[in-house]
């Protein structure tokens, strides 16, 4: 019998959860045997995109994945395809420990390979598979925001994961709006967070061999209240020839619920400030915007009668805020006619 | 560029009281934890005192707990260690330090000394 | 006492390797990233190793440090005079809720 042969008759294990992503670290040197699901008919393993070859010593064939020694080169992501559907049956990243070598002089490697529970060998005790994504300890964020701690772990059998709050168990009973708990994203999600949520939280992933835990610290920090603020240079003076298209923006940040105004500065009488001071404007448009968005003023065919100062005006329940800019509209034939008037500085205003 | 200033160092009688303050610029101070760590003359490194972004929450070393408080106003970028009832022991250079997200201090200020000396 | 133990010195002579080491705990090394700090001579301490192995812009590359388990160590490739300082590993601390710190080691370059 050829070796590939002999591997048919070894057993093979079926990756613990089907279609979620699973983490092994196998050792160096060590026989990899993984089947994809109970049939071995028209399911194949693929290797960061590429399909395995049938034949090699890292092939797909007959539905399982085999390796016969692991290699440094073998680490990566591998997919088990159902052929037809071309559904995901296992998403599977293999790892490799250097601490597990399995090659020595007084022993046989041993495979990855199951048992009578159906746990992956070796067995291991909890592990952190991207400490990077952990990196940020301490937190600081603005009350309203989202929350988001991430303890992503592997081992076998595969861990628990739990979350305490200052040391205390925490399924957020007590907090406005609850958590979402992502267990296979290893998550705590907290929206909208509150002063109240301020504190020191806590994974604690835990399997039979062992448990690891590591700690955030949370501090919210509440929005001190200020009218809308217009980024810089907003609406920007604009020069457009008769006919074309022009658009005004407008970037408004504000943390209450802003509400917009386009004005045309406009000329009465000859004037254009009333006796109270204040400048004559036609309202072109008026809007409610969500935080940090953009509003756009749509000026279409534009005429010579277009042209003068637009405002745009922001405000919420602390105060106002606007910025001015101004639009030349230039005849077709005097494309090539640029000149900075004085009046065609930007005007920047803040008022409350 | 990041700058941390302390001052309010000097002598003082074991018992007394003495006010750090650490200027910040060069940064938003306002989402930092900030720190303070003193060295006695010769030694090594000794974290003092830890306040939150919000100045909600402080942590102190078992060795100053009760008679040192630290605070921070935002408004004005600085941070403040209020020591009480000083003693001999806390003779040392205090520096201010700024705490990375990471949780290293990634600037430290030039260090202030606080002699307690009779 | 310190939380986190270092030797109190070490020495080596120019393009030589040392390495100094520093264990700690399950609630500081353990289960946080491991930091390095360089005390030059009368002067304040500047950040050398963050996040087990990760260097600030401006430190060569001379300086590398990795971390097991509750012990980290730091290692000095090519080492040169201007090395000779105090050299200090530090964690976060889950149970002080703030950074603890190695006793320092003192990092002679001979002749």
């Known amino acids: 019998l050829e070796a590939s042969e002999e591997m048919e008759q070894e057993p093979c294990l079926a990756p613990i959860l089907e279609q979620q992503e699973q983490v092994l670290t196998v050792a160096l040197g060590q026989p990899v045997r993984l089947c994809c699901g109970r049939t071995e008919r028209g399911r194949h393993w693929y290797k960061e995109g590429s399909r395995l070859a049938s034949a090699g010593r890292v092939r797909g064939w007959r539905g399982r994945l085999e390796i016969a020694s692991f290699l440094p080169e073998d680490a990566g992501r591998y997919l088990c395809l159902a052929r037809g559907s071309m559904t995901v049956v296992h998403n599977l990243t293999l790892l490799m420990d250097d601490s597990l070598t399995s090659i020595s002089n007084d022993e046989d490697p041993k495979t990855l390979s199951s048992s009578s529970s159906g746990h992956v060998y070796p067995q291991q005790a909890p592990y952190w598979t991207h400490p990077q994504r952990m990196e940020k300890k301490l937190h600081a964020v603005p009350a309203g925001n989202t929350v988001k701690f991430r303890c992503p772990a592997a081992g076998n059998p595969m861990p628990t994961i739990h979350w305490l709050k200052d040391g205390q168990a925490f399924h957020g009973e007590n907090r406005i709006g609850g958590i979402r708990l992502r267990h296979q994203h290893w998550s705590l999600v907290m929206e909208s967070v509150v002063p109240s949520d301020r504190g020191t939280y806590t994974c604690l992933v835990e399997n039979s061999l062992g448990s690891i835990r590591y700690s955030y610290l949370l501090d919210v920090l509440e929005r001190s209240p200020h009218r809308p603020i217009l980024q810089a240079g907003l609406p920007a003076n604009t020069t457009a020839v008769v006919g074309s298209d022009v658009e005004l923006l407008c970037k408004v940040y504000s943390d209450a619920q802003p509400h917009i105004q386009w004005l045309k500065h406009v000329v009465i009488n000859g004037s254009s400030f009333g006796a109270d001071g204040f400048p004559y404007v036609q309202v072109l448009k008026t809007t409610d915007i969500n935080s940090s968005e953009v509003e756009v003023l749509y000026l279409r065919n534009v005429s010579a009668e277009d042209a003068g100062e637009y405002t745009c005006l922001a405000g919420n329940s602390i105060g106002l805020s606007y910025q001015s800019a101004w639009l030349t509209v230039l005849p077709e034939e005097d494309l090539t006619w640029t000149t900075a008037t004085p009046e065609a500085a930007s005007h920047h205003h803040h008022h409350h | 560029e990041v700058q941390l200033l302390e001052s309010g160092g000097g002598l003082v009688q074991p018992g007394g009281s003495l006010r750090l303050s650490c200027a910040a610029s060069g940064f938003t101070f306002s989402p930092y934890w900030m720190g303070w760590v003193r060295q006695a003359p010769g030694k090594g490194l000794e974290w003092v005192s830890v306040?939150?972004?919000?100045?909600?929450?402080?942590d102190y070393a078992d060795s100053v707990k009760g008679r040192f408080t630290i605070s921070r106003d935002n408004s004005k970028n600085t941070l403040y260690l209020q020591m009480n009832s000083l003693r001999a022991e806390d003779t040392a250079v205090y520096y201010c330090?700024?705490?990375?997200?990471?949780?290293?201090?990634?600037?430290w200020g030039q260090g202030t000394l606080v002699t307690v000396s009779s | 006492q310190s939380e986190l133990t270092q030797p109190p010195s070490a020495s080596g002579t120019p393009g030589q390797r040392v390495t100094i080491s520093c264990s700690g705990g399950?609630?500081?090394?353990?289960?946080?990233?491991a930091h390095w700090y360089q005390q030059l001579p009368g002067t304040a301490p500047k950040l050398l190793i963050y996040n087990n192995n990760q260097r600030p812009s401006g430190v060569p590359d001379r300086f590398s440090g990795s971390k097991s388990g509750t012990s980290a160590s730091l290692a000095i490739s090519g080492l040169r005079s201007e090395d000779e300082a105090d050299y200090y590993c530090?964690?976060?601390?889950?149970?002080?809720?703030?950074?603890?710190f190695g006793g320092g080691t003192k990092l002679t370059v001979l002749g």
């Open positions: 399950y609630s500081n090394m353990g289960s946080n990233y």
């Open positions: 306040i939150w972004p919000s100045g909600g929450t402080t």
């Open positions: 530090a964690a976060w601390d889950d149970s002080l809720s703030g950074p603890v």
């Open positions: 330090a700024r705490v990375h997200p990471a949780g290293h201090n990634d600037h």
